[in-house]
């Protein structure tokens, strides 16, 4: 069950200030955050986990990936899980911790030493789930070794958004992923109506920037559901 996965091996930690960095939700071994209880004047810790639901890896932290907490688990339950360290099994790059990538089902180091100039590596894109691509085949993309050491500029190949420079995110473009600009106010955005639909995009857009949300454009409220245009709008 979800709780048994989430509530095993709890570690209590010293709590941060309210509104600051807290513990890690939904991993096998995790810190429980401190919370300032209303009416109280001291922090206490919680000896259980805080599952953080997600639809894709980008909604999780850089040290996490999005997946069902149990093998063959409920498709509607995906949470942020701790990334996998070197030599751990993986199905895609985002499962591996920063500085590693998924090769032949194992997280391996992406250190400079492991690359000789440019190498060809398989990027298996997940279109809706961890196990399949759009046509069942892996796409091959050339990755430059330097992408792991300098933040990618717009158009650079990436594995995750943390590979890209500030103001950019890592988004699907054909069969690879490249750094694209985070969307600004007024720009068209994609609102995923159902879980998993983000995986079908060949040209994926970034998310809206801080302080913006993807909403139906005011003058499109009367339009049919399928033709509604979403743009990044201020709160």
């Amino acid at each position: 069950t979800l709780n048994s996965v989430l509530n095993s091996n709890a570690i209590k930690n010293l709590p941060p200030p309210l509104g600051g960095a807290a513990g890690h939700p939904g991993s096998a071994v995790s810190a429980a955050p401190g919370i300032l209880y209303p009416g109280g004047n001291k922090y206490q810790t919680i000896d259980n986990y805080q599952p953080y639901p997600c639809a894709e890896d980008e909604e999780c932290g850089t040290d996490e990936y999005c997946a069902s907490p149990t093998r063959g688990g409920d498709a509607g339950v995906q949470i942020c899980l701790a990334c996998r360290k070197r030599r751990k099994r993986c199905m895609r790059h985002a499962m591996c911790c920063p500085g590693n990538y998924c090769k032949n089902g194992i997280c391996v180091s992406s250190d400079q030493n492991h690359f000789r100039g440019e190498i060809e590596e398989t990027i298996t894109e997940s279109f809706g789930n961890d196990h399949s691509t759009l046509d069942g085949y892996s796409r091959r993309t050339t990755l430059s070794s330097k992408m792991y050491h300098t933040k990618g500029q717009e158009g650079s190949v990436c594995l995750r958004s943390s590979d890209c420079a500030s103001g950019l995110c890592c988004a699907r473009h054909f069969w690879s992923k490249i750094c694209k600009p985070v969307l600004k106010e007024g720009q068209v955005c994609t609102k995923h109506r159902r879980k998993g639909s983000h995986g079908l995009e060949i040209f994926q857009r970034c998310y809206c920037g801080e302080g913006l949300s993807c909403r139906i454009q005011k003058d499109h409220h009367q339009a049919s559901n399928s033709s509604r245009l979403h743009t990044c709008q201020r709160h």
């Epitope: 890690h24 639809a55 996490e64 958004s161 709160h235």
Partner: nanobody, 125 residues
């Protein structure tokens, strides 16, 4: 300043229903997961339910699965918890929480950073 305000709590008989609401202000929450937690007297605060920013993924505590439903309205910046078939053991203060946006905003860990003050739910037998 970020504010989460819960409402909808109250006294209800076992088997009854309540709908909690959590209104968010001071920040755009449509890009962030939101959750409900509860704390009964003399017990630690526990997870109840959470929902992803898109509403596409939800998670529930085993104790409420099939009885409680979490939903959100991003246009209204509100998250809801529909509680059916309430039991006396559901009696607690219910807290709304909002997440931080994960790697989208440079965080290494996705987590709940903001909390409401809570609303009391009492289920009598």
């Amino acid at each position: 300043e970020v504010q989460l305000v819960e409402s909808g709590g109250g006294l209800v008989q076992a088997g009854g229903s309540l709908r909690l609401s959590c209104a968010a202000s001071g920040r755009t929450f449509s890009n962030y997961p939101m959750g409900w937690f509860r704390q009964a007297p003399e017990k630690e605060r526990e997870f109840v339910a959470a929902i992803s920013w898109s509403g596409g993924s939800t998670a529930y505590a085993d104790s409420v699965k099939g009885r409680f439903t979490i939903s959100r309205d991003n246009a209204e910046n509100t998250v809801y918890l529909q509680m059916n078939s309430l039991k006396p053991e559901d009696t607690a203060v219910y807290y709304c929480a909002a997440g931080n946006g994960g790697r989208n905003y440079g965080h290494s860990r996705a987590r709940y950073d903001y909390w409401g003050q809570g609303t009391q739910v009492t289920v009598s037998s």
